[in-house]
Interface confidence: low
């Protein structure tokens, strides 16, 4: 009865040419031990002959040989409960099915397993959380769906070019569930990190660039200001004029209100980006910002301490 | 350290009834096949039987068959040799031993041995 | 079941002699997966066998080399090169290929 066979396994493996692929797989038979087991690539099942066809890869025979191939692929089991698979080196025309075929005393099963192996390294992934703001710490991570025991690889981050200096955690999985080297780098961001490319690069052992993959930050921020004042030491007499500007340098999202602050009070109908003060008078004196919002929330530029002497 | 340690051993009369424990530590208890063996007094090793923790698979020698039964709880670590109808023959040291490897299948950890007398 | 039979059942030998037992299986126990389930185990008076050899020819970690193993098909041997004294015990062969898994019946190394 082939329904006592319950295999688990990664349903698809990715490496690429010269890598290696490592197949974590366990499985069940009710009545007994394994006797015998072939590793086929692509099988086909021939009606005629009531058999499979197709390249062997591996072999388990009475007298213990295998074929040349069994150097490159590597039965990693057992008689009854693990299937584990080692191919290395692997090689571009390695992709397809791999048919583990099973045989018991009164059972027969073909397990198949995807392979997909590619001809260059193929990229990492990076995930970033769906928002990210100015100085709070977020994780990236850096995903790539391939890790074997004999093909060490590492992760790096850069920012614009230039390795970060967190100190990233790497965790691969090699289980029946899943097959992945991850790396995950803790990082509080500031507003001047907005814009800036961030890459996670594939090196092997040696630190030898294999693949990469990037991504541009867009951290939420709120509006970044620079107030200037004509005269530019902010000292006055009664009666004088008095310009303030208010500059955006930076803001994300875009900005929706302007507004004018004394001694941290608002100033009423002052909701643009210049403030004229005309003929001041002495009760002007004091300390004036401007403050723009967002979504994020306000941004204040640094204070301005005007002085109004007497004529 | 991996270790096993057996318990529950003692005298029991012909037709009684006796649970062995086999406590693991240091390993990974559900992955890996726990076997039991006895040794009658001045006699040779005998393979009684295994259990996969794992999931409860079991095998035994046939003659072992009905009488003993092999069981194990991962929460607690330890297997169990349970023996009914015991026999004067039944009297042996019983050891517990791993199977240490998951393709070589060796015995590469044993226990101390506990001792069952079958006698009236 | 598959017999192992191990010759002698007990022999007498100095420090520094070469020994060497025999096991031999009343059948193949060549699994059919490739690999050939033969150990064998050293017993001491009073406590838990040990293993020296698996796979007929693999020594244990922690083995001396001076304990090796060969043999195929039904015939296997285990060497001791040079008898020390810690070496004076029991030997038992164990086939785990074939349901039920057997053990030979002993090989006592005694001090001559």
């Known amino acids: 009865d082939s329904s006592k066979w319950v295999f688990e396994h990664p349903e698809t493996l990715y490496a690429w040419e010269g890598a290696c692929v490592w197949i974590p797989c366990t499985y069940r038979a009710l009545d007994g031990d394994l006797e015998s087991f072939i590793l086929f690539h692509n099988p086909e099942y021939n009606k005629n002959t009531s058999k499979f066809d197709g390249t062997r890869l591996y072999e388990s025979t009475k007298d213990g040989k295998v074929p040349s191939e069994q150097k490159r692929v590597q039965f990693l089991g057992d008689k009854n409960k693990n299937c584990t698979l080692s191919i290395h080196p692997v090689h571009l025309n390695d992709s397809g099915q791999l048919g583990l075929r099973m045989e018991s005393k009164t059972e027969k099963w073909m397990e198949r397993i995807h392979l997909n192996v590619s001809e260059r390294p193929f990229p990492p992934h990076i995930q970033l959380p769906p928002e990210i703001q100015e100085s709070q710490e977020v994780t990236l991570t850096c995903l790539l769906n391939f890790s074997c025991y004999g093909y060490p690889i590492q992760l790096q981050w850069l920012l614009e070019g230039v390795p970060m200096r967190q100190a990233a955690v790497t965790s691969t999985s090699l289980t029946i569930k899943s097959v992945f080297t991850r790396s995950e780098l803790k990082f509080s961001p500031q507003w001047s990190h907005h814009g800036k490319i961030v890459t996670c690069q594939l090196q092997d052992a040696d630190g030898k660039f294999l693949s990469n993959d990037t991504v541009q930050l867009n951290v939420k921020h709120t509006p970044k200001l620079e107030i200037k004042v004509t005269p530019s030491d902010a000292i006055v007499r009664e009666g004088d004029s008095v310009t303030m500007t208010c500059e955006v340098s930076s803001s994300n999202p875009e900005y929706t209100t302007v507004s004018w602050l004394k001694d941290g009070t608002s100033l009423k109908k002052q909701n643009t980006f210049t403030l004229n003060l005309r003929e001041v008078t002495k009760d002007q004196s004091g300390k004036y910002c401007c403050q723009v919002s967002n979504d994020v929330g306000p941004g204040r530029s640094e204070e301005v301490f005007l002085q109004v002497q007497y004529a | 350290e991996v270790q096993l340690v057996e318990s529950g051993g003692g005298l029991v009369q012909p037709g009684g009834s006796l649970r062995l424990s086999c406590a693991a530590s240091?390993?990974?208890?559900?992955?890996?096949?726990m076997n039991w063996v006895r040794q009658a007094p001045g006699k040779g090793l005998e393979w009684v039987g295994r259990?996969?923790?794992?999931?409860?698979?079991?095998n035994y020698s046939g003659k072992f068959k009905g009488r003993f039964t092999i069981s194990a709880d991962t929460s607690k670590n330890t297997a169990y040799l349970q023996m009914n109808s015991l026999r004067a023959e039944d009297t042996a040291v019983y050891y517990c031993?791993?199977?240490?490897?998951?393709?070589?299948?060796?015995?590469?950890?044993w226990g101390q041995g506990t001792l069952v007398t079958v006698s009236s | 079941d598959i017999q192992m039979t191990q010759s002698p059942s007990s022999l007498s030998a100095s420090v520094g002699d070469r020994v060497t037992i025999t096991c031999r299986s009343s059948?193949?126990?060549?699994?059919?997966?490739?690999?050939?389930?033969l150990e064998w185990y050293q017993q001491k008076p009073g406590k838990a066998p040990k293993l020296l050899i698996y796979?007929?020819?693999n020594r244990f970690s922690g083995v001396p080399s001076r304990f090796s193993g060969s043999g195929s098909g039904t015939d296997f041997t285990l060497t001791i090169s040079s008898l020390q004294p810690e070496d004076f015990a029991t030997y038992y062969c164990?086939?785990?290929?074939?349901?039920?898994?057997?053990f030979g019946q002993g090989t006592k190394v005694e001090i001559k």
């Open positions: 031993a791993r199977d240490g490897s998951s393709w070589d299948w060796y015995f590469d950890v």
């Open positions: 240091g390993y990974e208890f559900s992955r890996s096949w």
């Open positions: 259990i996969y923790p794992g999931d409860g698979d079991t």
């Open positions: 059948q193949s126990i060549v699994h059919s997966v490739g690999n050939t389930f």
């Open positions: 796979k007929v020819s």
């Open positions: 164990f086939q785990g290929s074939q349901f039920p898994y057997t």
